[in-house]
């Protein structure tokens, strides 16, 4: 392992693109640690404000975590010659609040990208597609990790955060080859309905620890080879027949539903029936009712139709204010 000498300076690394020389095959940027044998470069917790320009050509795994990057501009990793081997890029926890269109262009082998734990007030629709064409060149990405990228309320744009993320995922149909998508802990209230239709190769989808109340307008039908669907720790009240039928029709899926506030009234009957016969739900014997109060902590699998009633709705003439 070679480690760049940081001389006497501990100031943030400031790359100057204008003066950048073509990188030597074995050089290591200042404030980074490099291992050619492992094809790995780590520039971790060094308060970098820009991506180093002089990354070695051999880099396959690049860790730029725990920095102060703020903005990732177009072509942030474009080099001449290109970083043709770079397969895994981890930018988590680097205080990014803006990822611009084309930020990951000219990385032909990039399979895994982790942007987690960055408060992304702005994620360009073309962050992953690289162009504004209606159909872009396919992205090589196979795994995209976007956990906890929601910015604080005061930094949010006018448009919905869900919509901003969705636009980046569907732009140019560039992510048709994506197998893994993690969107946990983003305060999502809903999943934009067109997103999953544009990601037909998804095998693993993590939507855990959001605020999803309903999946009524979400279709999983196109995700023919979905294997893992993580919906734990949301605000789901019930899964309706359409969703249940779609999930049952996916031959490889395992669904994770723990820690949702299930409402055990008459609308829950179909879901209970389905749970009793399905093999797709992991830990289904742990699912319990949260509401109404009289049903709290009852195990869903132990309920029968007589348990699942709804209070009669009074006709308007009998309702009191």
């Amino acid at each position: 392992t070679s480690s760049a000498s940081s001389s006497s300076s501990s100031a943030p690394f400031l790359a100057s693109a204008a003066s950048a020389q073509p990188p030597l095959p074995d050089q290591c940027p200042a404030l980074c640690e490099c291992s050619e044998a492992a094809r790995t470069v780590k520039c971790v917790n060094r308060n970098l404000t820009e991506v180093p320009t002089d990354l070695p050509l051999y880099v396959r795994n690049l860790f730029l975590t725990g920095n102060q990057l703020a903005v990732l501009p177009a072509g942030a990793f474009a080099r001449r010659p290109p970083l043709a081997e770079l397969a895994a890029l981890n930018l988590s926890g680097s205080r990014l609040d803006e990822v611009r269109g084309g930020a990951f262009e000219h990385l032909p082998s990039l399979r895994q990208l982790d942007l987690s734990h960055n408060p992304l007030a702005y994620l360009s629709p073309f962050a992953f597609s690289g162009s504004n064409a209606s159909i872009s060149a396919p992205s090589p990405l196979v795994e995209l990790i976007l956990n906890h990228i929601v910015p604080p309320d005061d930094k949010r744009q006018n448009r919905s955060f869900e919509g901003m993320v969705a636009a980046a995922l569907v732009a140019g149909r560039a992510l048709q080859g994506l197998h893994l998508l993690e969107l946990a802990s983003n305060h999502f209230l809903y999943l934009p309905r067109d997103v999953l239709a544009q990601l037909p190769s998804l095998r693993y989808l993590d939507l855990s620890n959001n605020s999803l109340v309903s999946l009524t307008y979400v279709s999983f039908r196109n995700l023919t080879h979905l294997e893992s669907l993580h919906l734990e720790d949301n605000a789901l009240k019930v899964l309706h027949n359409g969703t249940l039928a779609e999930l049952q029709g996916l031959p490889h899926v395992r669904v994770f539903l723990d820690n949702n506030p299930w409402v055990c009234d008459c609308h829950m009957a179909d879901m209970v029936t389905w749970l009793k016969q399905t093999g797709v739900v992991q830990g289904k014997d742990r699912l319990t009712c949260a509401f109404p109060e009289k049903m709290r902590n009852r195990v869903l699998l132990e309920l029968n139709s007589a348990d699942l009633d709804c209070d009669p709705i009074l006709p308007p003439s009998l309702q009191t204010s």
């Epitope: 023919t224 080879h225 294997e227 992991q282």
Partner: antibody, heavy 115, light 107 residues
Framework: EVQLQQSGPELVKPGASVKISCKAS????????MNWVKQRPGKGLEWIGR????????NYNGKFKGKATLTADKSSTTAYMQLTSLTSEDSAVYFC????????WGQGTSVTVSS | DIQMTQSTSSLSASLGDRVTISCRAS??????LNWYQQKPDGTVKLLIY???RLHSGVPSRFSGSGSGTDYSLTISNLEQEDIATYFC?????????FGGGTKLEIK
Amino acid sequence: EVQLQQSGPELVKPGASVKISCKASGYAFSSSWMNWVKQRPGKGLEWIGRIYREDGHTNYNGKFKGKATLTADKSSTTAYMQLTSLTSEDSAVYFCANGGAMDYWGQGTSVTVSS
Amino acid sequence: DIQMTQSTSSLSASLGDRVTISCRASQDISNYLNWYQQKPDGTVKLLIYYTSRLHSGVPSRFSGSGSGTDYSLTISNLEQEDIATYFCQQDNTLPWTFGGGTKLEIK
């Protein structure tokens, strides 16, 4: 691309058991499903079963229930298949295959049952 | 169990030919049909999944089609390296089942 490395050939006596392994590595997304497939010499392919490595959930072909037991070590991305009460009918090459659609296959492990 | 039938167990063709291999399921499998190639050395590779989706790294001369119970694999321009046995497999209903295989040889 995912690589699956299977354990080496086995020569075992009738009535004995054997446990073969399959380790996944590589840069592509590695599925949670690991399938096992049997191929007798000069014959076709038979699906034995599969294990979901995240939670150990299994599906078996009824024909192999009681014969094969699938397990997995999530931390080391290794899957195992144990075959018990072996007879000459169990002499075959056994493949592991990763993915719902069996996207990537191991090189096969030859099991020969002979006294 | 769903039976998968590959009616042609062996097939001879010339290099450059267009070759079609067929597969029939005993009931509707809703396009959950995969094609695998097994080389003479025993190595197995996925070619096509979900009837027509090309697996990564597979040459575009391979294509798949079909619906319901009838499916086919086409090699548009046969090359020497395509000499192998081809298996269809359904993953719509457990247990997954394979066809008996079609061995492709050079004339």
